[in-house]
Every structure is written in structure tokens, then in C-alpha cells.
């Protein structure tokens, strides 16, 4: 099966790479604009220059194109803890990231929030913190993992999943309680 092509892709595929079909005259292939510029006017005829203009401040194009407008620069989401890694230029969008010792949690494909990497107190680092993943901790004896923190088994209720990990401690507490009821 041939994948369905959109109108723009169909039109572009008729021209050699780096060119696009003139929207009013499909016998003309115009040269695409370089990154950092946008299409101001189509080329008037074969072999003639496309009128490309540089993107204005606050906008960019990251690849060769025949866009009528540059794209607006992204803004880092301060409320999500994001910081600007590199500023927007005419040919590259803003790059946002997290501070040192933080990782990204993606709420959706493009929206992320910065969180502090777990320190594994009362445990050891099993896997180091990565750009998009928190530290993976292994807890010391007498502690269990809850929301990636090592919590004392004294906080383990019988209904929780920690009962298997904290079984000796729970049995000891139970034994102490039983021995006190004679």
C-alpha cells in the first residue's frame, strides 16, 4: 500500500530535493529558503531566485522551508521548573532543560516538569539519575521503597505491599504485642 501523501508532500515530491513547486504554476520549481529564513515571495520563474527573508527576533526556522512565516520561539515553562539551556536563534528554537541533579518527567510528548533526583537515603543507588528518569534506589534492611524513597518498616501497615519486605519487623512487632497480653 502506498502511504497517503498530503498536498504539500505531493507537490514537493515532483521537484528535486531542495526545491518546491510554485503554488500558482506547477511547471516551476523554486528553491527552498535556508534555515533561519522564510518565504517572502515565490520565485518568478525557472532558475530565478526565491525571495527569502531572515526571521525576526523571537522567531526561527530550523530547516530549509517554504513557510510564509517563521515559527515562534518556545518559552521555557518556569512553573514546571524548566530552565533555558540555550536561547532561541533565527535557525534554532529555545532549548529548555532542568537544573543539575534533576530529571524530566514528561506529562506529554513535549511538556515536561523538573524533579529533584532521589538521594536514596537509607538505601543505595541501584541506577543513577538520568535525564528522563529518577534514581532507582535499593533500600537497606528495615526499610521499604515508597514513591522512590526508603521508608522505615515501622511505617508499614499490613494492608500495604511493604508487608513482604518488612515481614520480619512486622512479625517482631506482632510478637511483642502478643507477649504483652498474658
Amino acid at each position: 500500500l502506498v502511504p497517503h501523501l498530503g498536498d504539500r508532500e505531493k507537490r514537493d515530491s515532483v521537484c528535486p530535493q531542495g526545491k518546491y513547486i510554485h503554488p500558482q504554476n506547477n511547471s516551476i520549481c523554486c528553491t527552498k529558503c535556508h534555515k533561519g529564513t522564510y518565504l517572502y515571495n515565490d520565485c518568478p520563474g525557472p532558475g530565478q531566485d526565491t525571495d527569502c527573508r531572515e526571521c525576526e527576533s523571537g522567531s526561527f526556522t530550523a530547516s530549509e522551508n517554504h513557510l510564509r512565516h517563521c515559527l515562534s520561539c518556545s518559552k521555557c515553562r518556569k512553573e514546571m521548573g524548566q530552565v533555558e539551556i540555550s536561547s532561541c536563534t533565527v535557525d534554532r528554537d529555545t532549548v529548555c532543560g532542568c537544573r543539575k541533579n534533576q530529571y524530566r518527567h514528561y506529562w506529554s510528548e513535549n511538556l515536561f516538569q523538573c524533579f529533584n533526583c532521589s538521594l536514596c537515603l537509607n538505601g543505595t543507588v541501584h541506577l543513577s539519575c538520568q535525564e528522563k528518569q529518577n534514581t532507582v534506589c535499593t533500600c537497606h534492611a528495615g526499610f521499604f521503597l515508597r514513591e522512590n524513597e526508603c521508608v522505615s518498616c515501622s511505617n508499614c501497615k499490613k494492608s500495604l505491599e511493604c508487608t513482604k519486605l518488612c515481614l520480619p519487623q512486622i512479625e517482631n512487632v506482632k510478637g511483642t504485642e502478643d507477649s504483652g497480653t498474658t
Epitope: 518527567h105 506529562w107 506529554s108 510528548e109 511538556l111 516538569q113 524533579f115 514513591e147 522512590n148
Partner: nanobody
Framework: EVQLLESGGGLVQPGGSLRLSCAAS????????MGWVRQAPGKGLEWVSL????????YYADSVKGRFTISRDNSKNTLYLQMNSLRAEDTAVYYC????????????WGQGTLVTVSS
Amino acid sequence: EVQLLESGGGLVQPGGSLRLSCAASGFTFSDYTMGWVRQAPGKGLEWVSLIDRPGNHTYYADSVKGRFTISRDNSKNTLYLQMNSLRAEDTAVYYCAKWGLNVEDFDYWGQGTLVTVSS
């Protein structure tokens, strides 16, 4: 059909507390990020809080940080918002909302519950 039913709103004095609940049905609750959105009288929608599927990650608007706590019980298909130290500016209709998978926003809202903070 996705259904989100909020409860727990009402009139409360400044400094008081309320706990909102949201009963979800019509979709696999544990598969989705959930959140609370509010709309104050005459204002636009404001994200209040988000919570991921297992409940490990949360987001709070700066205006509620340290006062509100979002939580969820996947076994009960229920979302909660514990609201403490309430202020007059928290007066709004609060909507429980389901996060969309392919959008950077919520795709379903409940009918809302009114929270009024006044002395």
C-alpha cells in the same frame, strides 16, 4: 462514556479546609494522568494540580503550592484535592479533569463543584 463527578465543594471561612473528591468512570482510571482545574468568577481556566498514573509525580500552580495536596486511589477510581489554608482568591468552580494522551492539556472535564471562601 467518560464521566467525572466532583463533590466536596461548599462555603468555607478563610483559613479553613475542604477536601474535593472526583469519582471517575467510563475509562481505565489508572491509565491516565488526572488533575484539577479551576475557574474563578469572570476569569479563565487555571491549572491547579496534576498527578501522574501511579501518583509519584505531582504538579501544583504557584498560587496553591504548599496549601493544596492532590492524591488518587486507583483501586477506587477516585481523585482527591485536599485544600488547606483557603483564601478568598481560591473561590472558584473546581473541575476534575482527565489528561489527554496526545495533547498538552486535559481532554475531559467534570461538571465542577463550587468552592466559596468567605467570612
